[in-house]
Each structure stands twice: as structure tokens, then as C-alpha cells.
Interface confidence: medium
């Protein structure tokens, strides 16, 4: 019985399965386009199993290929608001270490008030992911409208 | 040889890998905003491996963290139709048991005719997921335009 | 020690975990609506572990259920461009073998300049996936704006 349990735990411990789903905490100060995230069961349905938060940014703890996904909804928004405040753009990227800095995922809102996408990308232990929202519109903090997550897929 | 087969089956049986991809069956009666889903190889490319359908709603059979994804396309739609009928909103949530009722994912159509998104969320055995489409526009039943699915990711 | 290593490799080798993330190489000639993809570490963050490219189209090497995802951004685009050139549509489907030809995922741009979606679908060894972009607008080749990938999920 103990052996069977150990078998079950193998993928979680040795193979990874690192996973995180975050909710929006706050936007950055005036000149900082980054969104700051939070996660944990006390906050609702957000969680971190493996990755960690470093000053509101997501830091990877295990090398591998990850599925990165995000949805951001603008708070006070109609299609006319979105087009009038264009360009409002969301970019997800590796922001540190600086030597690995790169944009992974980029979307503009145009006449919509929500963007949602996902992609597979290799990430390394220590990579910190930042999500930059440029423009004057504010994101909704509703947990079903704005969220950001990663899922380890394979080494 | 039998041992190798048993090894292969371990993750499917003991670790889960529950997965479902559903196609739209029909919308609800007048006061019921829920979409009713169907799945199975006889219907095309939809399937249920683990989760079950309960009166067109998806019921979870295994505790864990799931990737939930959805795409809904409005049937007779242009950007002017979509904006004229605004707000048309799609919400995915746990609708039963009532004690766990919560909205997991919400998107508005604004001037678009398709919404698509995905998120990671903890689900428990017995959770039933409902997809509520509010507004007067009808969803397309084309299987490449409207679909809803879940994938077990880890315990 | 060697046994532990073999254990870790089991899921990768015998259970699959085939995965690919591609970047846009080029569009097809006049009458060919297909997008042509490329992948490999020399190109940046794209890769193929299992699936292969056949003249820019993605060929599956292992039977199973896959998560297919795509994002396509139009190159010189505003909401007025997108609506003026409507319909611009993106479809992902099995294009060969001809006996299995089917559309898996379809989205229109309407007044937006980016589409992004994902779905679970059964695929078989030898299936080739094609991505057809119909309309007169051209896709962006920026690797954070346009990408296409698959992830093996379970047998």
C-alpha cells in the first residue's frame, strides 16, 4: 500500500506538475505598467504549487515546458471606451533574469474589453514572468474576469 | 509485457487524467440561461473520459486541479449585431452543490461574435459546471465554433 | 539510480507527452489559404518534441487526445481595418489524410485584430493539421503575436 502511494506521488514530486493560478492584486505605480498578482486558498480559488510570487510577479521553480495562460478584463469598459483608449495592450514576458528577457505573448484590446490567450513555452528555474498592461484603462479585479496561470507540461 | 502495460495504465487509472470535450446540444427554455451540452464518439469529436453529463451539465468525478476551456460563437452575428444586443455574456461556474456555487470564468461579447478562454481551477468530485449565456442572441451549434471542455491537471 | 532515471523517462517515452509550439514562417501562394509554420530552438522559443513539420504543416506522430491552441494577429490592423476586410476567418483542421479531413476550430476576426483559442481533440498518428486564414489581411510573424501548438494530453 505504501509503495502504491509512493508511485502516485512520483509525478508530483520528481516529474514536476508545477502549477499556479493567480488573481489580480493591484496595478503598479504611475510609471510601472506591471500587474501585481496574488494567490493562495485564503483568497479564493487561486493557488501556487511550485512557482512562487516575488513582489507580485511569478517566479518559476522548475525547468520545463509550460502552458502559460491569461485573461484580463478592463474594469469600466465598452467597445467605444476600448477603441477610444487604443492602444491598450497586454504583454506577458520573462522580465528577469535580464539575460533571458523576452515577450512571450502579446494582445491588444482594440474594440474588446477582454483578452484571453495561452501558449506553450520553455521556462527555466528562476525565470520571473511579468504581465504589462499599457494604456490608461484599469483592469477588473473580479476573480472570474482577470487571472493568470502556468502549468508545467513536460521537461 | 503485462507489467509494462500496467505501468502505462497507472497515470490513467490511479492518477486521473479525467478529460471531457463537449459540443452544444441546445439552449435552455425561456428563463434558463444555461447551455446544454452533449458528448460521445457517435456525435463526432466530443468525448467524456471520467466526467459525466447530468441533464446536459458537466459533473466532475475526481478531485483535482482542472484546466477548464470554452469557446462560444453566436449564430447569426456581425459586430453590429453583437454591439446592438450588448450585454451578451458567457459565464462558466460551479452551479451545484449550492454550497460551492461560484463563477469561474466570465466574458462579454461586446463587438465580437466569439469568446474563447481557459483557466486552471480546483474542482471536487460532484461539482457540476454550468455555462450561462445571458442576452438574446443564440449560440452556433457548429462543433468547430462552440465547445466546452475540462482536463484534469494534477491532484 | 539508473532505474529511477528510467522511471522518470517512462511518461515521456511510453506515455507520450508529445508537444509542439510553432511560429509563423510564411503564408501560402495566391490560392493557398494555409499558413506555413516553422519550429526549433534555433528560431527562438518554438520546438517540436514528437510531432513533425511536413512542408510547413504539423504532422502528428502519436495517437491520443491533444490540446490544440492557436493565436493569430493580423499584421497592419485596426478595428476599422478588420471590419472593412470582414470576413477574415481562421480555421484549424485535419487536412490529411483526406478520409479524416475535418474542421476542428474556427474563428472570425470581426472588429478585432487577434484571435486566440484552444480545444481538446482526438488525433491519430499521421494526421496533418492545417491552419487556413481566409481574407485579404496578412498575419503578423512576431513570435509573441502569432503561434500554434499542440500538447498530448492522454491516450
Amino acid at each position: 500500500q505504501r509503495f502504491a502511494q509512493a508511485q502516485q506521488q512520483l509525478p508530483l514530486e520528481s516529474l514536476g506538475w508545477d502549477v499556479a493560478e493567480l488573481q489580480l492584486n493591484h496595478t503598479g505605480p504611475q510609471q510601472d505598467p506591471r500587474l501585481y498578482w496574488q494567490g493562495g486558498p485564503a483568497l479564493g480559488r487561486s493557488f501556487l504549487h511550485g512557482p512562487e510570487l516575488d513582489k507580485g510577479q511569478l517566479r518559476i521553480h522548475r525547468d520545463g515546458i509550460y502552458m502559460v495562460h491569461i485573461q484580463v478584463t478592463l474594469a469600466i469598459c465598452s467597445s467605444t471606451t476600448a477603441s477610444r483608449h487604443h492602444p491598450t495592450t497586454l504583454a506577458v514576458g520573462i522580465c528577469s533574469p535580464a539575460s533571458r528577457s523576452i515577450s512571450l505573448l502579446r494582445l491588444s484590446f482594440h474594440q474588446g474589453c477582454t483578452i484571453a490567450s495561452q501558449r506553450l513555452t520553455p521556462l527555466a528555474r528562476g525565470d520571473t514572468l511579468c504581465t504589462n498592461l499599457t494604456g490608461t484603462l484599469l483592469p477588473s479585479r473580479n476573480t472570474d474576469e482577470t487571472f493568470f496561470g502556468v502549468q508545467w507540461v513536460r521537461p | 509485457q503485462r507489467f509494462a502495460q500496467a505501468q502505462q495504465q497507472l497515470p490513467l487509472e490511479s492518477l486521473g487524467w479525467d478529460v471531457a470535450e463537449l459540443q452544444l446540444n441546445h439552449t435552455g427554455p425561456q428563463q434558463d440561461p444555461r447551455l446544454y451540452w452533449q458528448g460521445g464518439p457517435a456525435l463526432g469529436r466530443s468525448f467524456l473520459h471520467g466526467p459525466e453529463l447530468d441533464k446536459g451539465q458537466l459533473r466532475i468525478h475526481r478531485d483535482g486541479i482542472y484546466m477548464v476551456h470554452i469557446q462560444v460563437t453566436l449564430a447569426i452575428c456581425s459586430s453590429t449585431t453583437a454591439s446592438r444586443h450588448h450585454p451578451t455574456t458567457l459565464a462558466v461556474g460551479i452551479c451545484s452543490p449550492a454550497s460551492r456555487s461560484i463563477s469561474l470564468l466570465r466574458l462579454s461579447f461586446h463587438q465580437g461574435c466569439t469568446i474563447a478562454s481557459q483557466r486552471l481551477t480546483p474542482l471536487a468530485r460532484g461539482d457540476t459546471l454550468c455555462t450561462n449565456l445571458t442576452g438574446t442572441l443564440l449560440p452556433s451549434r457548429n462543433t468547430d465554433e462552440t465547445f466546452f471542455g475540462v482536463q484534469w491537471v494534477r491532484p | 539510480q539508473r532505474f529511477a532515471q528510467a522511471q522518470q523517462q517512462l511518461p515521456l517515452e511510453s506515455l507520450g507527452w508529445d508537444v509542439a509550439e510553432l511560429q509563423l514562417n510564411h503564408t501560402g501562394p495566391q490560392q493557398d489559404p494555409r499558413l506555413y509554420w516553422q519550429g526549433g530552438p534555433a528560431l527562438g522559443r518554438s520546438f517540436l518534441h514528437g510531432p513533425e513539420l511536413d512542408k510547413g504543416q504539423l504532422r502528428i506522430h502519436r495517437d491520443g487526445i491533444y490540446m490544440v491552441h492557436i493565436q493569430v494577429t493580423l499584421a497592419i490592423c485596426s478595428s476599422t481595418t478588420a471590419s472593412r476586410h470582414h470576413p477574415t476567418t481562421l480555421a484549424v483542421g485535419i487536412c490529411s489524410p483526406a478520409s479524416r479531413s475535418i474542421s476542428l476550430l474556427r474563428l472570425s476576426f470581426h472588429q478585432g485584430c487577434t484571435i486566440a483559442s484552444q480545444r481538446l481533440t482526438p488525433l491519430a498518428r499521421g494526421d496533418t493539421l492545417c491552419t487556413n486564414l481566409t481574407g485579404t489581411l496578412l498575419p503578423s510573424r512576431n513570435t509573441d503575436e502569432t503561434f500554434f501548438g499542440v500538447q498530448w494530453v492522454r491516450p
Partner: nanobody, 116 residues
């Protein structure tokens, strides 16, 4: 817990002005943003103006240039100054506060009627 009490609603002629107040009490240190919503008869509740803890502000298109949201931290109060009022501004106006854990708190609402 956060308690919110609105005041300042009433009947006003088109083109007139009103100032709504929302006084917050309780766990106010936990508040991230405060907002004014409105709900006209038979319509969905809509977000009108939003002010977040670092001072950023957004307005709905329909009120931009006419309404101003502000706050007095010393009094734990948020205001909505409404000028050039129109009949379509008639609604029940609700004060909303959201804490850092994205929990919503609501006031009881105050009626604003714009009519000649």
C-alpha cells in the same frame, strides 16, 4: 467587514447637479478600490466611476466630463460630483468597495431622479 452608507440623492432638473457621498467604516485599511455603480429600472447595474488606492481613476464613457469621483481619506469618504445631469442618469446609485482579496461590499443605494 466594511460598511458603506450613501447619501446625497434626490430629485433634480435636467442640467442640474448633485453630490453623492459614501462613508466607509469598519476594516477600511483593507480597501483597494471604491466605485460608484448605478442601476436604472429594468436595466443591469453598471459601473460609473472607479478610484483605486494609488489614486488612479476611470469613468464610464456616458459620464466622462460630467461626473467627478474623489475621496477624502481623513473622513473615509468617497464622493461623486454629478454635473449637467440628464434624464438618462436617473437610477439608484450604489457605492462599492473592494478589498485586497477582491471581496465586494455594497451600500444600500440612493435614488437619483432627473426630471423637469
Amino acid at each position: 467587514q466594511v460598511q458603506l452608507v450613501e447619501s446625497g440623492g434626490g430629485l433634480v432638473q435636467p442640467g442640474g447637479s448633485l453630490r453623492l457621498s459614501c462613508a466607509a467604516s469598519g476594516s477600511i485599511a483593507s480597501i483597494y478600490h471604491m466605485a460608484w455603480y448605478r442601476q436604472a429600472s429594468g436595466k443591469q447595474r453598471e459601473l460609473v466611476a472607479l478610484i483605486i488606492s494609488d489614486g488612479k481613476i476611470n469613468y464610464a464613457d456616458s459620464v466622462k466630463g460630467r461626473f467627478t469621483i474623489s475621496r477624502d481619506n481623513a473622513k473615509n469618504t468617497v464622493y461623486l460630483q454629478m454635473n449637467s445631469l440628464k434624464p438618462e442618469d436617473t437610477a439608484v446609485y450604489y457605492c462599492n468597495a473592494q478589498n485586497w482579496a477582491t471581496r465586494d461590499y455594497w451600500g444600500q443605494g440612493t435614488q437619483v431622479t432627473v426630471s423637469s
